[in-house]
């Protein structure tokens, strides 16, 4: 997509505070980079319902980030 240029974040809003756990297929964390200077938490929804941005400051996002980091390190 041409909209993803340098300095472009994936989320166009601050992110929702929570997503129903039962609706979550996958959670991806995008760390600050050349493309975007902030952390973004992208939730892929089940049943091809697309993706939602989760507010990285929310309790749910912090739990997800902790879980992913624990798994990766």
């Amino acid at each position: 997509f041409p909209m993803f240029k340098r300095g472009r974040c994936l989320c166009i809003g601050p992110g929702v505070k929570a997503v129903k756990v039962a609706d979550i297929e996958k959670a991806s964390i995008m760390y600050p980079s050349n493309n975007c200077d902030k952390i973004e938490v992208i939730i892929t929804l089940k049943e091809n319902k697309g993706q939602r941005c989760l507010n990285p400051k929310s309790k749910q996002a912090r739990l997800i980030i902790k879980k992913v980091e624990r798994k990766n390190f």
Epitope: M3, F4, R8, C9, I12, G13, P14, C53
Partner: nanobody, 127 residues
Amino acid sequence: EVQLVESGGGLVQPGGSLRLSCAASGFTLDDYAIGWFRQAPGKEREGVSSISSSDGRTYYADSVKGRFAISRDNAKNTVYLQMNSLKPEDTAVYYCAADQGVVAYDALRPYRWLEVWGQGTLVTVSS
């Protein structure tokens, strides 16, 4: 009560201009991405333009690029759609929507905007 109210629609001649407003009550618009969408009679709702919450990134449908401009005034809790060089095919009910969770590639996909929708304002372009 959380709501969006659109205004500024009406009858205009081809080539004319209109400015639509989308005013929020019950919440602050600067915490949300805002989108303008339209639905012509017998057609599906389609994306027109949207603007991000933080950095003011804007998105436009190809059919309105260079003619429409989206802007936001956070002090007035309002988003505007300036529509110039209007064509008969721009005739539709125009809706605004606010959402915190939209990803960039869904910026013009109405079915991905899940949070707050207005009731719409009718724009008719006819001579």
